[in-house]
């Protein structure tokens, strides 16, 4: 808390300009009118104030707007945004995408901070859903943003927003998140033809059920091994050797290198060795010929 002291004669600020960098903290407090600061916030970012001086300016704005800053001030916060706490930001009502962009620009290159997370949360909640323009903006600044959301939060993403998602935006998503996103992507891309559809849906396939993988196997998609390895194990297990061969096309040879890793390892254990041998890859660990295969999962479901 800065002491209240009278402004020295001749030092009262008439405008926000570079002369203020020479003011001590107490002089800034005493000589800068908060209302003047609020109307000339756009100038602050061009002036090399120290972090300590910015603390004083923030304090003045906090006194002027105890209930939270108006958007006209928020949009021009610049580096002062880095001084805001999540508690400060929770008082704001940010509705303009331009304001959001301006603040994310200030934070560009920084790690995702609690302040930014709070800002995004306030903005998205204010909009009611994560629309395409917002998602476009957020993933441009934070490619991992989508995967930082819980499955519950992802459920508010409308299918139309899925068009804004790039493959790299899903890199860190776990299966639970892809389970939510996949049906939305399927809906979003449903009117595309086979090969175009596969290009778009590919990065979401970690959430695809068995029946969709079976359908894809009939479309000559030539799925690469990296995508196959990200599929849900429970979705891959029921696929036949023939279906996996069709699904992977020329990439089927890559199974050999992955035979010790999930889901390939678990899938091999479910296939007849005879069927695996037809691939000519030397895959081992299938069910020996003459053995009876019992589907215990069906039995468990009935009991």
């Amino acid at each position: 808390e800065v002491e209240k002291t009278a402004c020295p004669s001749g030092k009262k600020a008439r405008e926000i300009d570079e002369s203020l960098i020479f003011y001590k903290k107490w002089e800034l407090e005493a000589c800068v009118d908060a209302a003047l600061l609020a109307t000339q916030m756009d100038r602050v970012n061009a002036i090399p104030f120290t972090y300590e001086q910015l603390d004083v300016l923030k304090h003045k704005l906090d006194e002027l707007y105890p209930q939270g800053y108006p958007e006209s001030v928020i949009q021009h916060l610049g580096y002062l945004f880095l001084k805001m706490s999540p508690e400060d930001i929770r008082k704001w009502n940010v509705t303009s995408l331009e304001t959001l962009k301006a603040l994310l620009e200030v934070n560009k290159g920084h790690e995702m901070s609690p302040q930014v997370a709070t800002l995004i949360d306030r903005f998205v909640k204010g909009r009611g859903q994560l629309d395409k323009d917002t998602l476009d903006t957020l993933t441009a600044f934070y490619p991992g943003y989508l995967c930082s959301l819980s499955p519950e939060e992802l459920s508010s993403v409308p299918p139309s927003s899925i068009w804004a998602v790039r493959p790299q935006d899903l890199d860190t998503c776990d299966p639970r998140q892809l389970d939510v996103l996949y049906p939305k992507a399927r809906l979003a891309f449903q009117n595309m033809n086979g090969s175009e559809y596969f290009v778009k849906i590919q990065s979401f396939l970690g959430g695809a059920p068995t029946e969709d993988l079976k359908a894809l196997s009939q479309q000559n998609v030539s799925m690469d091994l990296a995508t196959f390895m990200k599929l849900r194990t429970d979705a891959v297990l029921p696929l036949t050797v023939a279906e996996v061969q069709k699904l992977l096309g020329p990439h089927v040879e890559g199974l050999k290198a992955e035979e010790r890793h999930r889901p390939v390892r678990d899938w091999i254990l479910r296939q007849r060795q005879d069927d695996l041998d037809t691939l000519g890859l030397g895959l081992q660990g299938g069910i020996p010929n003459g053995y009876l295969v019992l589907d215990l999962s069906m039995q468990e479901a009935l009991s």
Epitope: E18, A46, I47, P48, T50, Y51, E52, H110, E111, S113
Partner: antibody, heavy 117, light 107 residues
Framework: QVQLVESGGGVVQPGRSLRLSCAAS????????MSWIRQTPGKGLEWVSY????????YYADSVKGRFTISRDNAKNSLYLQMNSLRAEDTAVYYC??????????WGQGSLVTVSS | DIQMTQSPSSVSASVGDRVTITCRAS??????LAWYQQKPGKAPKLLID???RLQSGVPSRFSGSGSGTDFTLTISSLQPEDFATYYC?????????FGQGTKVEIK
């Protein structure tokens, strides 16, 4: 008077890790942003990372992003730099500095990190 | 990233000389510029920030000027203790970047 003392430097093999520490005294550490800056004969001075007074705002130079982690312990008046997956090009004298925003007003004496096989 | 270019890279001068070092930014940085002095085996020392704000304890023979892309550090009357390397640094945008340095040597 303000003092910053780095420690933890040394010779390390490529791919290994090292943790630098910076002990601060003579000022209210918890009120100040802090930075790590390194200096090499080839590239000169390079700003590596900074951390806000509370530790909530952090920035890394692209050259170290994903490998280095800056942190602070305000109760111990200490700043840290955890350096993983070290490369030959990380060889440098590492300085911790008090960060004013427009400038770095106090620097430590530096800690030499040599990455070599 | 903003590139900072200093000139000259070295300058030979005598005690009492007026020395001028320039620093050019690859894009406008308003007044977000600092100057440092470094002596061999020592850490850099802040002389000036905000293009012209002299730090306390720094002799008044040092002065800084400029705005936008072109900046100048002037030593009005060189003293024996001023022989060192001088660096400029921008803080207008992240990452902050330094000039390559100007070495002031004894003629």
């Amino acid at each position: 008077q303000v003092q910053l003392v780095e420690s933890g430097g040394g010779v390390v093999q490529p791919g290994r890790s090292l943790r630098l520490s910076c002990a601060a005294s003579g000022f209210t550490f918890s009120d100040h942003y802090m930075s790590w800056i390194r200096q090499t004969p080839g590239k000169g001075l390079e700003w590596v990372s900074y951390i806000s007074s509370s530790g909530s705002t952090i920035y890394y130079a692209d050259s170290v992003k994903g490998r280095f982690t800056i942190s602070r312990d305000n109760a111990k008046n200490s700043l840290y730099l955890q350096m993983n997956s070290l490369r030959a090009e990380d060889t440098a004298v590492y300085y911790c500095a008090r960060d004013l925003g427009p400038s770095f007003d106090y620097w430590g004496q530096g800690s030499l990190v040599t990455v070599s096989s | 990233d903003i590139q900072m270019t200093q000139s000259p890279s070295s300058v030979s001068a005598s005690v009492g000389d007026r020395v001028t070092i320039t620093c050019r930014a690859s894009q406008g940085i308003s007044s977000w510029l600092a100057w440092y002095q470094q002596k061999p085996g020592k850490a850099p020392k802040l002389l000036i920030d905000a293009a012209s704000r002299l730090q306390s304890g720094v002799p008044s023979r040092f002065s800084g000027s400029g705005s936008g892309t072109d900046f100048t550090l002037t030593i009005s009357s060189l003293q024996p203790e001023d022989f060192a390397t001088y660096y400029c640094q921008q803080a207008n945008s992240f990452p902050r970047t330094f000039g390559q340095g100007t070495k002031v040597e004894i003629k």
